[in-house]
Interface confidence: medium
C-alpha cells in the first residue's frame, strides 16, 4: 500500500514499524519512541500551551475592536486560524505517544489532521490579503481613504477562509483509518489508492499554492513597501525592517521542512533510503510547521515591547496597542507610525 500516508497531515507514509506488542520485551521497536517523535512531542506541548493561551488573548483583545478597526479584523482571523489548529494538538500528541496508533475514529481522522492544512491555507491567504492592504495603504492612499472599510475587510477574510476550505478538501477526502491486525494497530492517514500521480499532484499543488507562489508575491510586495517606506526619513528604521522580515519569513521558515519533505516523498520510491529517513522525520516536520500556530502572539508581544521601549503595560493593553491601532492615510501619501508598526506585525506566518 505504497500510497498510504500516516499520522498528521499528508506526508509521512504509512509505516507500521512502531508497535506496542504484548508479551514482548522492551526493545527499540516496540516500546521506545524515535528521537524525532520525542522532539515533535516537546514542540507540540509548547505550541499548544503558547498557542492556545496566546491566540485566545489575541482573539479577546481584537474581538472588541474588530467592528471598527481593520487591523483588528486581520489579527482576529489569523488568531482564530491558529487557535483552531492548536485544538487538534492533544489528539495528535496522544497518537504519537501511542506509536501513531489512532483510537479516535474515522471522523476525527478526517477532520483533526486537516486543521493544520486549513491553517496553512487560511494563514497564507489572510497574509496575502493583509499584504495587499499594506500595499494599497502605501501606494493607493486615496483609494484607501474612499473604500477601505471594515465591511470590505470582512468580505476579504470570508473569501480567504472559503478558498482555504476548498484547498483542504483533497486531504479531507483521502483520509482514512486503517487497521493492522498483526502487530495490532489502528492508523490514520491518507490513502491515494496506489495512484502516485494523484499523490504528486496534491503535493505539487500544496507546494505551489501554499508556499512558492505566496513566497514570490509577498517578497515582491514587501520589497516595494520597504523601498517606499525606507525612502521616507520618518520611517527609515532597521527596527521596522527586522519586524517586517520576521512577519514574512516565519511562515516560510516553519513550513519549509514540511513542504520539502512532502514533495520529495511524493517523488521517491518507498523503498529508497532517503524516503525511509524522511518518513521517520515526518512528525518532526509537522510539529515544526505547527510552530506557526503560536509564533504570532510571541511576535506581537516582542514587537509591542520594542515600540513601547520596555514592557510597561499589561499584556492585554500592550497587545491592544499593537493590534488595534488603525492605519491613518495622510494626504502626503506617507503614513503614520502606527501604520508602520502594525504593518510590521506578524499576521501569521507569512
Amino acid at each position: 500500500m505504497n500510497s498510504f500516508n500516516y499520522t498528521t497531515p499528508d506526508y509521512g507514509h504509512y509505516d507500521d514499524k512502531d508497535t506496542l506488542d504484548l508479551n514482548t520485551p522492551v526493545d527499540k521497536t516496540s516500546n521506545t519512541l524515535r528521537v524525532p517523535d520525542i522532539l515533535a512531542l516537546v514542540i507540540f506541548a509548547v505550541v499548544f500551551l503558547v498557542g492556545v493561551l496566546g491566540n485566545a488573548l489575541v482573539v479577546w483583545v481584537t474581538a472588541f475592536e474588530a467592528k471598527r478597526t481593520i487591523n483588528a479584523i486581520w489579527f482576529l482571523n489569523l488568531a482564530v486560524a491558529d487557535f483552531l489548529s492548536c485544538l487538534a494538538l492533544p489528539i495528535l500528541f496522544t497518537s504519537i505517544v501511542q506509536h501513531h496508533h489512532w483510537p479516535f475514529g474515522g471522523a476525527a481522522c478526517s477532520i483533526l489532521p486537516s486543521l493544520i492544512l486549513l491553517n496553512m491555507y487560511a494563514s497564507i491567504l489572510l497574509l496575502a490579503t493583509i499584504s495587499a492592504d499594506r500595499f494599497l495603504l502605501v501606494f493607493k492612499p486615496i483609494w484607501c481613504q474612499n473604500f477601505r472599510g471594515a465591511g470590505l475587510a470582512w468580505i476579504a477574510c470570508a473569501v480567504a477562509w472559503g478558498l482555504a476550505l476548498l484547498l483542504t478538501i483533497p486531504s479531507f477526502l483521502y483520509r482514512v483509518v486503517r487497521e493492522e491486525y498483526f502487530p495490532p494497530k489502528v492508523l490514520c492517514g491518507v490513502d491515494y489508492s496506489h495512484d502516485k500521480r494523484r499523490e504528486r499532484a496534491v503535493a505539487i499543488v500544496r507546494l505551489v499554492l501554499g508556499f512558492l507562489w505566496p513566497l514570490l508575491t509577498l517578497t515582491i510586495c514587501y520589497t516595494f513597501i520597504l523601498l517606499r517606506t525606507w525612502s521616507r526619513r520618518a520611517t527609515r528604521s532597521t527596527k521596522t525592517l527586522k519586524v517586517v522580515v520576521a512577519v514574512v519569513a516565519s511562515f516560510f521558515i516553519f513550513w519549509l521542512p514540511y513542504q520539502v519533505t512532502g514533495i520529495m516523498m511524493s517523488f521517491l520510491e518507498p523503498s529508497s533510503p532517503t524516503f525511509l529517513l524522511l518518513n521517520k522525520l515526518d512528525s518532526l516536520c509537522v510539529s515544526f510547521a505547527y510552530i506557526n500556530c503560536c509564533i504570532n502572539p510571541i511576535i506581537y508581544v516582542v514587537a509591542g515591547q520594542g515600540f513601547q521601549g520596555r514592557l510597561r503595560k499589561s499584556l492585554p493593553s500592550l497587545l491592544r496597542n499593537v493590534l488595534t491601532e488603525e492605519s491613518v492615510v495622510r494626504e502626503s501619501k506617507s503614513f503614520t507610525r502606527s501604520t508602520v508598526d502594525t504593518m510590521a506585525q506578524k499576521t501569521q506566518a507569512v
Partner: antibody
Framework: QVQLVQSGAEVKKPGASVKVSCKAS????????MNWVKQAPGQGLEWIGR????????KYNGKFKGKATMTADTSTSTAYMELSSLRSEDTAVYYC??????????????WGQGTLVTVSS | DVVMTQSPLSLPVTLGEPASISCRSS???????????LHWYLQKPGQSPQLLIY???NRFSGVPDRFSGSGSGTDFTLKISRVEAEDVGVYFC?????????FGQGTKLEIK
C-alpha cells in the same frame, strides 16, 4: 495488484541450510512487516517471526530462534528466510505473509504460494 | 504462548446443512486497545490459507455471508449457515493479540 512470489521447492540433506525467498510487489515493502509461517505435513500453522525490511529489524517466535534467520533486500523487494542445521522435522511448507490490514478503502491479507522444503538423507 | 484449541478436529457435513467450529484460547484475547484479534482462515487443498473472518466477527472482502463469527474473551465460534462444496478444507483460528501469533490445530471440513 499485490503479489508475494516464493522460490521453488527444495530438497536438502540433514545438517545443511536452505534459503527461501519471497518477492513482493504492489505495496510498500520497506514499510511493512513481513511474516514467515511454517506448516509441517498434515499439521497446523506456526508463526516463525517477522522482519521489517526498512531497517532489517526482526522479531522471532522463541521456538525458531537459532533455527531461522530472516533478512530482506529492499532494492529488490525480496524477503529471505534461511533455515540452518536442517533436520527431518524441518520438512514443511514455508509461507511468507503480509498480514491483514483494513481501511475504508481496502482490505487485504497476502500470502505467498508456499515453498516446500524437504529434509531427507 | 497462547494455546488455541479447536473442536472438532474433523467435521463431516451434508451439503446445505449448517456447520459450527469452536475455538478456545488459553488466555483472554482482548487487546489493551479494546479490540479482540481472533481470526478464522480456510486452507483449501493445495492452496495457501485465506482469511475468512477477522476480529471475531468481521467478514473479509469477498467472503460469502453464509460465514459468520462470534464469541468473546476466550471462546469463539465460526458458523457456516449452509455448507457448499467449495467450503471443503481445513479451518484454522488464529490470534494476533499476543506475541507470538498462534494458530489452532485446524478443523477439517468434509462433505458426507
Amino acid at each position: 495488484q499485490v503479489q508475494l512470489v516464493q522460490s521453488g521447492a527444495e530438497v536438502k540433506k540433514p545438517g545443511a541450510s536452505v534459503k527461501v525467498s519471497c518477492k513482493a510487489s504492489g505495496y510498500a515493502f520497506s514499510n511493512s512487516w513481513m511474516n514467515w509461517v511454517k506448516q509441517a505435513p498434515g499439521q497446523g500453522l506456526e508463526w516463525i517471526g517477522r522482519i521489517y525490511p526498512g531497517d532489517g529489524d526482526t522479531k522471532y517466535n522463541g521456538k525458531f530462534k537459532g533455527k531461522a534467520t530472516m533478512t530482506a533486500d529492499t532494492s529488490t523487494s525480496t524477503a529471505y528466510m534461511e533455515l540452518s542445521s536442517l533436520r527431518s522435522e524441518d520438512t514443511a511448507v514455508y509461507y511468507c505473509a503480509r498480514f491483514l490490514l483494513i481501511s475504508t478503502v481496502t482490505a487485504v491479507d497476502y500470502w505467498g504460494q508456499g515453498t516446500l522444503v524437504t529434509v531427507s538423507s | 504462548d497462547v494455546v488455541m484449541t479447536q473442536s472438532p478436529l474433523s467435521l463431516p457435513v451434508t451439503l446445505g446443512e449448517p456447520a459450527s467450529i469452536s475455538c478456545r484460547s488459553s488466555q483472554s484475547l482482548v487487546h489493551s486497545n479494546g479490540n479482540t484479534y481472533l481470526h478464522w482462515y480456510l486452507q483449501k487443498p493445495g492452496q495457501s490459507p485465506q482469511l475468512l473472518i477477522y476480529k471475531v466477527s468481521n467478514r473479509f472482502s469477498g467472503v460469502p455471508d453464509r460465514f459468520s463469527g462470534s464469541g468473546s474473551g476466550t471462546d469463539f465460534t465460526l458458523k457456516i449457515s449452509r455448507v457448499e462444496a467449495e467450503d471443503v478444507g481445513v479451518y484454522f483460528c488464529s490470534q494476533s493479540t499476543l506475541v507470538p501469533l498462534t494458530f489452532g490445530q485446524g478443523t477439517k471440513l468434509e462433505i458426507k
